[in-house]
C-alpha cells in the first residue's frame, strides 16, 4: 500500500540531518501527491485516448474545477503570500469532492487513488496551520458536494472517462502552481 511521506524508511531523517521544517514537509507532501496523480494518469491514459485530446475539446466539458489565476496572487507576477495561501487551501477544499468521485474510477490503482485523497486531507491540515487569514477560507457546502457527486456519477461512460482525465490534469496543474508558490513563501 502507498505510504505517506514520513512513513517509510527513506523519509526518516538520518541521525546527522536536521528534521524537516514545516515548509519542507509540505513540499515533500505535495510531491508525494503529484507522484500519485502521475500513476493515476498513467492508468487513465492507457485505457482511453483522453490524454491526447486538445485543450479546446476538454474545455467543452463544463466542470467547475479550481484553477489558479493571476488575481489569486500565486504567480510570480503579483505574488501575494496571504492571498495565495487562502486560494491554495480553498482550492484544495473544492477539489475534495472530485477526489471522492475518483475513488471508484480505478482498477489497478485503487489504493493510489485512496492515498491521493487521504494525503490531500493531511495537506489541507498542514496548510491551515500555516495560514494566518483563516476567515477568508470558504468551505464548500456538504449538500452541494453531494448533489455534484450524484450528477458526476450519473454521466455516461465517455463523459466519466473525460471527467476523470480532467480532474487529474487540473489537480496536477493546481498542485504544481501551489508548489511553486509555496516555495516563494
Amino acid at each position: 500500500a502507498p505510504v505517506l511521506p514520513g512513513e517509510d524508511s527513506k523519509d526518516v531523517a538520518a541521525p546527522h540531518s536536521q528534521p524537516l521544517t514545516s515548509s519542507e514537509r509540505i513540499d515533500k507532501h505535495i510531491r508525494y501527491i503529484l507522484d500519485g496523480i502521475s500513476a493515476l494518469r498513467k492508468e487513465t491514459c492507457n485505457r482511453s485516448n483522453m490524454c491526447e485530446s486538445s485543450k479546446e475539446a476538454l474545455a467543452e466539458n463544463n466542470l467547475n474545477l479550481p484553477k489558479m489565476a493571476e488575481k489569486d496572487g500565486c504567480f510570480q507576477s503579483g505574488f501575494n503570500e496571504d492571498t495565495c495561501l487562502v486560494k491554495i487551501i480553498t482550492g484544495l477544499l473544492e477539489f475534495e469532492v472530485y477526489l471522492e468521485y475518483l475513488q471508484n474510477r480505478f482498477e489497478s490503482s485503487e489504493e493510489q487513488a485512496r492515498a491521493v485523497q487521504m494525503s490531500t486531507k493531511v495537506l489541507i491540515q498542514f496548510l491551515q496551520k500555516k495560514a494566518k487569514n483563516l476567515d477568508a477560507i470558504t468551505t464548500p457546502e456538504p449538500t452541494t458536494n453531494a448533489s455534484l457527486l450524484t450528477k458526476l456519477q450519473a454521466q455516461n461512460q465517455w463523459l466519466q472517462d473525460m471527467t476523470t482525465h480532467l480532474i487529474l490534469r487540473s489537480f496536477k496543474e493546481f498542485l504544481q502552481s501551489s508548489l511553486r508558490a509555496l516555495r516563494q513563501m
Epitope: 510531491r31 507522484d35 498513467k42 485543450k55 489558479m68 510570480q76 507576477s77 502552481s177 516555495r183 516563494q184
Partner: antibody
Framework: QVQLVESGGGLVQPGGSLRLSCAAS????????MTWVRQAPGKGLEWVSS????????AYADSVKGRFTISRDNAKNTLYLQMNSLKSEDTAVYYC????????????????WGQGTQVTVSS | DIQMTQSPSSLPTSLGDSVTITCQAS??????LSWYQQKPGQTPKLLIY???RLQTGVPSRFSGRGSGTSFTLTISGLEAEDLATYYC?????????FGQGTKVELK
C-alpha cells in the same frame, strides 16, 4: 521525433523589439512546460523565462522582467518570446527548451533544446 | 533569489580520470537540480535531473549526488567525448539559476 525550431532572431537597435517563435512538433505540446534559455557570446547559460502548461503561470529572470513576455499558442504548437526595450546585454543565442514530462512532475530539467536563434542588439 | 556557485570553473584532467564538479546553492533546493553538458558549437544536453536521476541515453559513467544545498556531478573514467562545459541548474524556485559552468579540458 521531438523537434523545436526557433525563428525571429536578428539584428536590432537598442530600445527596439523582436518576437521570437519556437515551433514544436513530435509531442503533445500543451502538456509540457516550456522555457527560454539564452547564452551570450563566450558566456554561460542563463535561464530567461518559463511558461506552464494550462495555468498561464509565467516566470522571468530579474534581468528581463517587465521587458520580455513569454506566451504560447497550444493550437499552433508554438512558443513565443516578445522582447521589448532591448539592451546590448540581451545579445545572445536564444534556445527554446522543453521541460521534462511524463512521470516526473515537479523536477525541472530541460530534455529537448532547439538549435537556437541569434539576437544581436547593436547600434 | 537562490544563487548557484559552481566549482571549479576550469578542470584540467586526463582521459580515464574520475572527475567531480560541485554546485552549491545559497539555500535548500531539495533535489531540484539538473546537470547539462555543452560541447563547443552544440546545444546543451541534459545529463542528470532530480539531483541523481540519469537521463535516458546518458552513459552510466555520469552520476549525480546531493540534496539540500550541496551537489556533485561525477564522471567515472573520463572519455574524449566528455571534454565539454558542464552546468548545474536549480529548478526549485523562481528565478531559476544556472551555475557559472565548469570547463573540463585536457591537462
Amino acid at each position: 521525433q521531438v523537434q523545436l525550431v526557433e525563428s525571429g532572431g536578428g539584428l536590432v537597435q537598442p530600445g527596439g523589439s523582436l518576437r521570437l517563435s519556437c515551433a514544436a512538433s513530435g509531442f503533445t505540446f500543451s502538456n509540457y512546460y516550456m522555457t527560454w534559455v539564452r547564452q551570450a557570446p563566450g558566456k554561460g547559460l542563463e535561464w530567461v523565462s518559463s511558461i506552464y502548461s494550462f495555468s498561464g503561470d509565467t516566470a522571468y529572470a530579474d534581468s528581463v522582467k517587465g521587458r520580455f513576455t513569454i506566451s504560447r499558442d497550444n493550437a499552433k504548437n508554438t512558443l513565443y518570446l516578445q522582447m521589448n526595450s532591448l539592451k546590448s546585454e540581451d545579445t545572445a543565442v536564444y534556445y527554446c527548451t522543453r521541460n521534462l514530462g511524463g512521470v516526473v512532475v515537479t523536477t525541472n530539467g530541460y530534455d529537448y533544446w532547439g538549435q537556437g536563434t541569434q539576437v544581436t542588439v547593436s547600434s | 533569489d537562490i544563487q548557484m556557485t559552481q566549482s571549479p570553473s576550469s578542470l584540467p584532467t586526463s582521459l580515464g580520470d574520475s572527475v567531480t564538479i560541485t554546485c552549491q546553492a545559497s539555500q535548500s533546493i531539495s533535489d531540484e537540480l539538473s546537470w547539462y553538458q555543452q560541447k563547443p558549437g552544440q546545444t546543451p544536453k541534459l545529463l542528470i535531473y532530480g539531483a541523481s536521476r540519469l537521463q535516458t541515453g546518458v552513459p552510466s559513467r555520469f552520476s549525480g549526488r546531493g540534496s539540500g544545498t550541496s551537489f556533485t556531478l561525477t564522471i567515472s573514467g573520463l572519455e574524449a567525448e566528455d571534454l565539454a562545459t558542464y552546468y548545474c541548474l536549480q529548478g526549485y524556485s523562481w528565478p531559476f539559476m544556472f551555475g557559472q559552468g565548469t570547463k573540463v579540458e585536457l591537462k
